[in-house]
């Protein structure tokens, strides 16, 4: 009797009615039920559709734009409980833009355990004022029932018997009104004696067992409930799951092997978003609670030492990151169980996006392969990568593999980054802009020195197109004004002076002195540095009178710190050996100057001898503002003010009393009274600030809800099947 049919997973039924038949044998939907976006359905399509076995939905019920559906009384005649374990934007029942729905008709709905109700923009929907929601859920004040036909007082809601002058349905008091309670013209709302609480009662008004929820077929018997208040086990409702059982999904008891099967099904499946269920404190749960991490071998949650790692298990043991989208799938991961292959050829704002998605990875159990990633300039987006275990290796026993990365110039800033490679070798070939010194530094830091064989690091195809600077350029002269910086640096000439094509000056605003050369750079044009090309100076034969190259940086912001460095631009020599020089990054601040004008000055007189002046600080202070200068001068009076007869009738009263100029302009506008010309008639009172605020909040809340609904509901079609949609799981 208790849950006679099957337990079905959450469903998203859209576009047409074909999938609705999957509900046929469901007693419980473990998850949510969304029925939506059916624009071609007609009332007759729903005539013979009924799912009498459906008793409970564990999450929420959402109906949105289903045309032709006029009532739910035949569709879900026995739906008794919506648990609201996971909610849709705080709601357990959402009826939104159901253009043909005339009544809810859920006449057996007795309990919404958690969450509230949102019924909005249903032009034909009546029988709302006849429902006492306080008998169904606790948080009635959070219900949002607006913009339905019911609002316009156009509904002639008639409860059963009313037409014959009888009152068949129970009446309850809401807001001081004693109203008959019904769902449709033929179905009363069932109201049990208050002593029964939410357990429900029989038709005779006898209370159900305290473990029941909503209804029962016999009083005081936990095996005769229609739904359970706590947990369901072996045909009865129980307060808690006794060992050997585990609590599952907040409503039923399952054994260990059930939980284990769920875990392994997910682990072995390729489906995104499934949960590798774990066991913790008598519960079989989708993931470990915060502060715990999963031990995959025994399904346990073990306490984390420090911040919890997020272990991401890669299907087939490896994952190729070839776009920002594929990087997003690893967002938040701290440990990669498998190997990563980076193959990024292009994209927008890559360095920042990759850091946002891969920047928390601390450990890779397999290997890391960077292959034909033309867009990468640096690997610094792996900001926290500290360990490559090399438990699985690339062919040839490599745990770090870099091949054909045309623009890769830096691995990490080795002065700030530690990386250990437990086992496996390094492989570097065809990375023309990556200097060998950078690779050798990695060997030292990572502990792989001595592991590599002769051809693992190609001497001729790494750094062969780079100016692998081995000399340090020093600035010899720095002068600042409020919008300019003049720089000079020591001259540099390669062995063949004709190889020097010039210098590149890099600069950018840097509020903090923590900038590195490759921050924010990729090879697709994203570069946080401004670059200036500077011709080499004229070469003098006298080494003592060499011209110091330099540049005047113009159009800078006053009182702003800039990070600056300069490097040489040299030709590629025949011997496949390049020279060059580069400066350290220096920080220079421009001078202060006059601030821009103060903003939004307001002046008000509050007496015959005072003027109050208020303003906002300038948008560009251009330095530390220490004080303001206020100038004023007396103006001649307007002659009209003297000539006006102030006793003339018909003059309007002043529209508002003086108030200090500290409110926003909007609130001042709202405070103005609008007096009407028609004498003797009362004017409408202005809205109070709190009313206006409430209206603004409500309008904003409505927009937020609609945005949320559209974001969740409108999803791209699956390319494979062409029907259905992704299964979003809001909470």
């Amino acid at each position: 009797h208790l849950y006679p049919g099957e337990v079905c997973p959450g469903m998203d039924i859209r576009n047409n009615l074909t999938r609705l038949h999957e509900l046929e044998n469901c007693s419980v939907i473990e998850g949510h039920l969304q029925i939506l976006l059916m624009f071609k359905t007609r009332p007759e399509d729903f005539r013979d559709l009924s799912f009498p076995k459906l008793i409970m939905i564990t999450d929420y019920l959402l109906l949105f734009r289903v045309y032709g559906l006029e009532s739910l009384k035949d569709l879900f005649p026995n739906l008794t409980v919506i648990r609201g374990s996971r909610l849709f934007f705080n709601y357990a029942l959402v009826i939104f833009e159901m253009v043909h729905l005339k009544e809810l008709g859920l006449y057996n709905l007795m309990n919404i355990t958690r969450g509230s109700v949102r019924i909005e923009k249903n032009n034909e929907l009546c029988y709302l004022a006849t429902i006492d929601w306080s008998r169904i859920l606790d948080s009635v004040e959070d219900n949002y029932i607006v913009l339905n036909k019911d609002d316009n007082e156009e509904c002639g809601d008639i409860c059963p018997g009313t037409a014959k002058g009888k009152t068949n349905c129970p009446a309850t008091v809401i807001n001081g009104q004693f109203v008959e309670r019904c769902w449709t013209h033929s179905h009363c709302q069932k109201v049990c004696p208050t002593i029964c609480k939410s357990h429900g009662c029989t038709a005779e008004g006898l209370c159900c067992h305290s473990e029941c929820l909503g209804n029962c077929s016999q009083p005081d018997d936990p095996t005769k409930c229609v739904a359970c208040r706590n947990f369901y086990l072996d045909g009865r409702c129980v307060e808690t799951c006794p060992p050997p059982y585990y609590h599952f999904q907040d409503w039923r008891c399952v054994n260990f092997s059930f939980c284990q099967d769920l875990h392994h099904k997910c682990k072995n499946s390729r489906r995104q978003g499934c949960h590798q269920y774990v066991i913790h404190n008598n519960k079989c749960i989708p993931e470990c609670p915060s502060g715990y991490t999963m031990n995959s071998s025994n399904l346990l949650c073990t306490p984390c030492l420090g911040p919890c790692p997020k272990v991401c298990h890669l299907l087939e043991g490896e994952k190729t990151i070839d776009s920002v989208t594929s990087a997003q799938e690893l967002r938040g991961c701290t440990v990669i169980n498998g190997s990563l292959i980076i193959n990024i050829r292009g994209g927008n704002n890559l360095a920042a996006e990759l850091e946002a998605n891969l920047g928390l990875i601390e450990e890779i159990s397999g290997y890391l392969k960077i292959r034909r990633s033309y867009a990468l300039v640096s690997l610094s987006f792996f900001r926290k990568l500290r360990l490559i275990r090399g438990e699985t290796l690339e062919i040839g026993n490599y745990s770090f593999y870099a091949l054909d990365n045309q623009n890769l110039r830096q691995l990490w800033d080795w002065s700030k980054h530690n990386l250990t490679i437990t086992q496996g070798k390094l492989f570097f070939h065809y990375n023309p802009k990556l200097c060998l010194s950078e690779i050798h530094k990695m060997e030292e830091v990572s502990g792989t020195k001595g592991r590599q064989e002769r051809n693992d690091i190609a001497l001729k195809t790494n750094g062969d197109q780079a100016s692998c600077e081995n000399e340090l350029l020093k600035f010899s002269y720095i002068r600042t004004s409020f919008d300019k910086i003049l720089l000079r640096w020591e001259p540099y000439w390669p062995p063949d002076f004709r190889d020097l094509l010039g210098f590149m000056l890099f600069y950018k605003e840097a509020p903090y002195q923590n900038v590195t050369e490759f921050d924010g750079q990729d090879a697709c044009g994203s570069n946080s540095w401004t670059v200036v090309d500077i011709d080499p100076p004229l070469r003098s034969n006298d080494p003592k009178s060499q011209n110091h190259p330099g540049w005047l940086m113009r159009g800078l912001k006053p009182w702003t710190q800039y990070a600056i460095f300069v490097k040489t631009l040299v030709t590629f020599s025949d011997e496949r050996r390049t020279y060059g020089a580069k400066s350290d990054i220096i920080y220079v601040q421009t001078d202060a100057t006059n601030p821009s004008v103060p903003l939004d000055p307001i002046s008000v007189s509050n007496s015959s001898s005072q003027i109050i002046l208020k303003w906002k600080p300038p948008s560009d202070p251009n330095g530390n503002i220490t004080h303001y200068l206020v100038f004023w001068e007396r103006q001649a009076e307007d002659s009209e003010l003297f000539e006006l007869d102030y006793c003339l009738k018909g003059l309007k009263l002043p529209s508002r009393t003086w108030s200090p100029p500290f409110e926003s302009e909007d609130s001042q506008k709202h405070n103005q009274s609008e007096y009407e010309d028609s004498a003797g008639e009362c004017c409408s009172c202005p809205k109070t600030d709190s009313q206006i605020l409430k209206e603004l909040e409500e309008s904003s809340f409505r927009k937020t809800f609609e945005d949320y609904l559209h974001n969740v509901v409108f999803v791209p079609r699956k390319t494979s099947s062409g029907t259905g949609a992704e299964d979003p799981r809001p909470s």
Partner: antibody, heavy 116, light 110 residues
């Protein structure tokens, strides 16, 4: 008053049989899993057997499997433990205990002595 | 040999705080909640703590329980002479498919 009262203990020879009963009162007997737990003289507690609400599921400790049978009669609010092929090491004070997630209610115990 | 390991004895003076440990494995404490029982001399055991750290009504708040990983512990603060008893931890073991108890800890109030 909530209580469990065990009976049926006594002296029995090795290989013999004994049937213990546990009468429940003051609570809804059928709403609980029921257990037998024993304690050998001067020793710690040892779980013996468990039965579900309606008797459809039963669990036994390895040490008694195949020799002991747990059963219940919800109409009489009584739990039973049929003990066959008794051994000297089965000598103990036998408690019945009701269970939700823990053993909430305990009886005072009945002593079973297996000796020749 | 008990599946759950407890120290055989513990002691303290009145007013002191004592802690009794209970160590298990992944198949029991690791995935289950732990219960603690008090057995006063010559009486039946009584439930003291259930679900790791919850006290049944009537149990003073001087008794508290906790669990971490595959170990649990019972703490008794403000020790009194009437606390002198045997204390047992227990939980369900999924490998053995049955309840398991610790060997018990005899608490002496000096």
């Amino acid at each position: 008053e909530v209580q469990l009262l065990e009976s049926g203990g006594g002296l029995v020879q090795p290989g013999g049989s004994l049937r213990l009963s546990c009468a429940a009162s003051g609570f809804t007997f059928s709403d609980y899993y029921m257990n037998w737990v024993r304690q050998a003289p001067g020793k710690g507690l040892e779980w013996v057997a468990l039965i579900s609400y309606d008797g459809s599921n039963k669990y036994y400790a390895d040490s008694v499997k195949g020799r002991f049978t747990i059963s219940r009669d919800n109409s009489k609010n009584t739990l039973y433990l049929q003990m066959n092929s008794l051994r000297a090491e089965d000598t103990a004070l036998y408690y019945c205990a009701s269970q939700s997630t823990a053993f909430d209610i305990w009886g005072q115990g009945t002593l079973v002595t297996v000796s020749s | 040999q008990s599946v759950l390991t407890q120290p055989p004895s513990a002691s303290g003076t009145p007013g002191q705080r004592v802690t009794i440990s209970c160590s298990g494995s992944s198949s029991n404490i690791g995935r289950r909640t732990v219960n603690w029982y008090q057995q006063l001399p010559g009486t039946a055991p009584k439930l003291l703590i259930y679900d790791n750290n919850k006290r049944p009504s009537g149990v003073p708040d001087r008794f508290s329980g906790s669990k971490s990983g595959t170990s649990a512990s019972l703490a008794i603060s403000g020790l009194r002479s009437e606390d002198e008893a045997d204390y047992y931890c227990a939980t369900w073991d999924d490998s053995l498919n049955g309840w398991v108890f610790g060997g018990g800890t005899k608490l002496t109030v000096l």
